[in-house]
């Protein structure tokens, strides 16, 4: 989750967020021929005391969360971050204006969890 | 990076930091036999554009930071977690007294990334 | 030994402004977070704000009365921590202190002897 | 209104045992929180009394002690002094951003 996100209240749990993302938005539309966009989606939310078992944290996030309740001046919470990724296929032009089709690895979120 | 370092400069980019963990400290003493303590370390820093690459982002991160710079408010930029972790043998009691030894998983940071 | 010693403290108008120092000594002042906390006349401890060290990119953090109004900044160069304060209301008036935070359990383990600021017209 | 809530208030006799609590919620000392203790003097800047809920930093003499239950947190001074007169106050985090959290303060006073 990220440092600019200044909630005074308390955030929720970590989980994935849906996000659709068009690639004309980021401008890829030139050379991307499809999809259009994707269903990308994004983790977000709070990673603390007691990490439950569906946070799939690690034994790190575990043994850090409660560090950082012990000094929490000096030691970050977890953070929530993809644990499952999908890759997508992508038909484009390269730089010699072929049309290509290429799977791109570790393009949609399908979990997140306590890292 | 966690949401609760409300951060309003420009923190240091997405890496490793070292940290030695008491067992003591985590009140897990009477349970653990050895070690005492590990160098757990743990991850932390911003995920900014770009993402350089000793930032080991996923294709998902690097959209991800992109869809952020467009909509801040609602898209937070990716977060510095641990992209390859150890593990450590630990000697201890179980339930019934008996003296164990067993390799937990994921218990030091190796490196950290952008995800 | 440890040691923090605040100035720049002193009378000025509602709407002013001044710049507080705590200047430190004894210890490795970039390794550690510090703290601004305030005590207005017989009244407790109100935290004011922090800021990290550089591993975390002096991060700073302010409570709710003073954020938009405060300003924490650090120059580790010359070991010293500065509090901007503008826009001042007569409820800033109170003994600010500069806090340094101990690197195992996060607690005040040294506190400066303390500024007074008085906002009064 | 502080965060974490005292009594304003404790008194005891020289020798006797008085106890000081500390009232906080699910989002901060609730949330798992250290919580650390802090001892003023009058006329002084706060002095760190109890750091970690039970620990003490060198010099603090051990008739003070420290606990933590739940979403409270208790400070506990034995043999009670002239020298104990002063404001204590709680301290801990609030989970939302991980801002520092004080106690209102109790003066004690040595009967």
């Known amino acids: 989750s990220a440092s600019d996100y200044n909630s005074s209240e308390l955030k929720t749990a970590c989980r994935k967020h849906e996000l659709y993302v068009s690639f004309q938005d980021l401008g890829w539309q030139d050379w991307i021929i499809a999809p259009k966009g994707y269903a990308a989606n994004y983790c977000d939310g709070e990673c603390s005391f007691p990490l439950n078992a569906h946070m799939n944290a690690t034994n790190h996030a575990i043994v850090q969360t409660l560090v950082h309740l012990m000094n929490p001046e000096y030691v970050p919470k977890p953070c929530c971050a993809p644990t499952k990724l999908n890759a997508i296929s992508v038909l484009y032009f390269d730089d010699n204006s072929n049309v290509i089709l290429k799977k791109y690895r570790n393009m949609v979120v399908r979990a997140c969890g306590c890292h | 990076s966690a949401s609760d370092y409300n951060s309003s400069e420009l923190k240091t980019a997405c890496r490793k930091h070292e940290l030695y963990v008491s067992f003591q400290d985590l009140g897990w003493q009477d349970w653990i036999i050895a070690p005492k303590g590990y160098a757990a370390n743990y991850c932390d820093g911003e995920c900014s554009f770009p993402l350089n690459a000793h930032m080991n982002a996923t294709n998902h991160a690097i959209v991800q930071t992109l869809v952020h710079l467009m909509n801040p408010e609602y898209v937070p930029k990716p977060c510095c977690a641990p992209t390859k972790l150890n593990a450590i043998s630990v000697l201890y009691f179980d339930d019934n007294s008996n003296v164990i030894l067993k390799k937990y998983r994921n218990m030091v940071v190796r490196a950290c990334g952008c995800h | 030994q440890v040691q923090l010693v605040e100035s720049g403290g002193g009378l000025v108008k509602p709407g002013g402004s001044l710049r507080l120092s705590c200047a430190a000594s004894?210890?490795?002042?970039?390794?550690?977070?510090v703290h601004w906390v305030r005590q207005a006349p017989g009244k407790g401890l109100e935290w004011v704000g922090r800021t990290r060290h550089s591993d975390m990119g002096y991060a700073t953090s302010y409570a709710a009365p003073v954020k938009g109004r405060f300003t924490i900044s650090r120059d580790d160069s010359k070991n010293t921590l500065y509090l901007q304060m503008n826009s001042l209301k007569t409820e800033d008036t109170a003994v600010y202190y500069c806090?340094?935070?101990?690197?195992?359990?996060?607690?005040?383990?040294?506190w400066g002897q303390g500024t007074l600021v008085t906002v009064s017209s | 209104q502080s965060v974490l809530t005292q009594p304003p208030s404790v008194s005891g006799a020289p020798g006797q045992r008085v106890t000081i609590s500390c009232t906080g919620s699910?989002?901060?000392?609730?949330?798992?929180?250290?919580v650390h203790w802090y001892q003023q003097l009058p006329g002084t800047a706060p002095k760190l009394l109890i750091y970690g809920q039970s620990e003490r930093p060198s010099g603090v003499p051990d008739r003070f002690s420290g606990s933590k239950s739940g979403t409270s947190a208790s400070l506990a001074i034995t043999g009670l002094q002239a020298e104990d007169e002063a404001d204590y106050y709680c301290?801990?985090?609030?989970?939302?951003?991980?801002?520092?959290?004080f106690g209102g303060g109790t003066k004690l006073t040595v009967l």
């Open positions: 806090a340094r935070v101990e690197r195992s359990k996060s607690g005040f383990d040294n």
């Open positions: 301290q801990s985090w609030d989970s939302s951003q991980t801002l520092v959290v």
């Open positions: 004894g210890f490795t002042f970039s390794s550690y977070v």
């Open positions: 699910s989002s901060n000392i609730g949330a798992g929180y250290s």
